[in-house]
């Protein structure tokens, strides 16, 4: 039985131009974290693999960067990058976890984070 | 400098087995992953297996799978592939290959490719 | 059959540029890193490009990747006698959980 929960940041929203970071935390479960896959709408971003290390996608290779931990910073941000974000946790034995992230990318100098939310 | 060995090749019947062998040297293998990649004769690659670094993450090629198994001793520096219920279609030149791997101070990358094989070692699956 | 498909031969002479595409039947090009290998004759393959567009140590500048939505391509410039061989591209198919090749383009030295 899948007892865990994926905590994430949630709703956030950014400065274009400016960077962020993509955080989720997988708790309230023993199984092992074997891989998290980053993901934006049916694109991958990037791998963080426990055995191997991180594989970013060349598509964003310019863009993006791993950490802190097992999230990932986005850089230069743009208008484009407003969307729907997920990191998608691998576990044993558990099987897969996911968390959805919001991000706004905003033109304005106002650009406040949103709560953050679970996900069972 | 950097050298795979294949062995444990040759002929054997349908049905048969056979496991192979691919000794590393000149790098720190437990940090690499490994892939078995063979060669029909007169055709092109093909991808049969990899395994990480520890050996806790496994792929197959669905061509072998349930047939075929990778496993690799990292005190010994050796990967294999053990080879069940060969058919003719596996006939082919088996070679072991290095994954790229790459490390800064803060992370490791990694690539999907292969940059060092070795020769091959020749199966013939006949009767 | 393979998820990218290559043209079965290609060929050119000394001092041409040369061009082999590889075109993905699926998504896996898109945002997978392709390599590209060449394999002489009688040997084994050897590694030319990796990460789209990344040369390891030793590979001559006159071979370069490039990529474009679901095309790679391996461009040959300045090409040579000794560039005669089979070429393959490759990448990671997530959906395949697999490393899959394309089926190689025999280059003609003419």
């Known amino acids: 039985m899948m007892t865990g929960t994926i905590e994430t940041t949630g709703n956030i929203s950014a400065e274009k131009g400016g960077s962020i970071i993509l955080q989720c935390h997988l708790s309230s479960t023993t199984a092992q974290v074997t891989q998290v896959n980053w993901e934006q709408q049916d694109q991958l971003l990037a791998i963080c693999n426990a055995d191997l290390g991180w594989h970013i996608s060349p598509s964003f290779k310019d863009r993006v960067a791993p950490g802190p931990g097992l999230g990932l910073t986005l850089q230069s941000l743009t208008v484009n990058d407003t969307g729907e974000y997920f990191c998608i946790y691998h576990t044993y034995p558990d099987g897969t976890y996911t968390g959805r992230i919001f991000l706004e990318v905003l033109e304005s100098s106002v650009a406040e984070h949103g709560a953050r939310f679970q996900i069972p | 400098e950097v050298q795979l060995l294949e062995s444990g090749g040759g002929l054997v019947q349908p049905g048969g087995s056979l496991r192979l062998s691919c000794a590393a040297s000149?790098?720190?293998?437990?940090?690499?992953?490994m892939s078995w990649v063979r060669q029909a004769p007169g055709k092109g690659l093909e991808w049969v297996s990899g395994?990480?670094?520890?050996?806790?993450?496994?792929y197959y090629a669905d061509s072998v799978q349930g047939r075929f198994t990778i496993s690799r001793d990292n005190s010994k520096n050796t990967l294999y592939l053990q080879m069940n219920s060969l058919r003719a279609e596996d006939t082919a030149v088996y070679y072991c290959a290095k994954a790229i791997r790459t490390c800064s101070l803060s992370h490791c990358y990694y690539y999907y490719g292969m940059d060092v094989w070795g020769q091959g070692t020749l199966v013939t699956v006949s009767s | 059959q393979s998820v990218l498909t290559q043209p079965p031969s290609a060929s050119g002479t000394p001092g041409q540029r040369v061009t082999i595409s590889c075109s993905s039947s699926s998504s896996n090009i898109g945002s997978n890193a392709v390599n590209w290998y060449q394999q002489l004759p009688g040997t084994a393959p050897k590694l030319l490009i990796y990460?789209?567009?990344q040369r390891p140590s030793g590979v001559p500048d006159r071979f370069s990747g490039s990529k474009s939505g679901t095309s790679a391509s391996l461009a040959i410039s300045g090409l040579r006698s000794e560039d005669e061989a089979d070429y393959y591209c490759a990448t990671w198919d997530y959906s395949l959980s697999g490393y899959v090749f394309g089926g190689g383009t025999k280059l003609t030295v003419l």
């Open positions: 990460y789209d567009n």
């Open positions: 000149g790098f720190t293998f437990s940090n690499y992953a």
């Open positions: 395994i990480s670094p520890s050996g806790s993450s496994i």
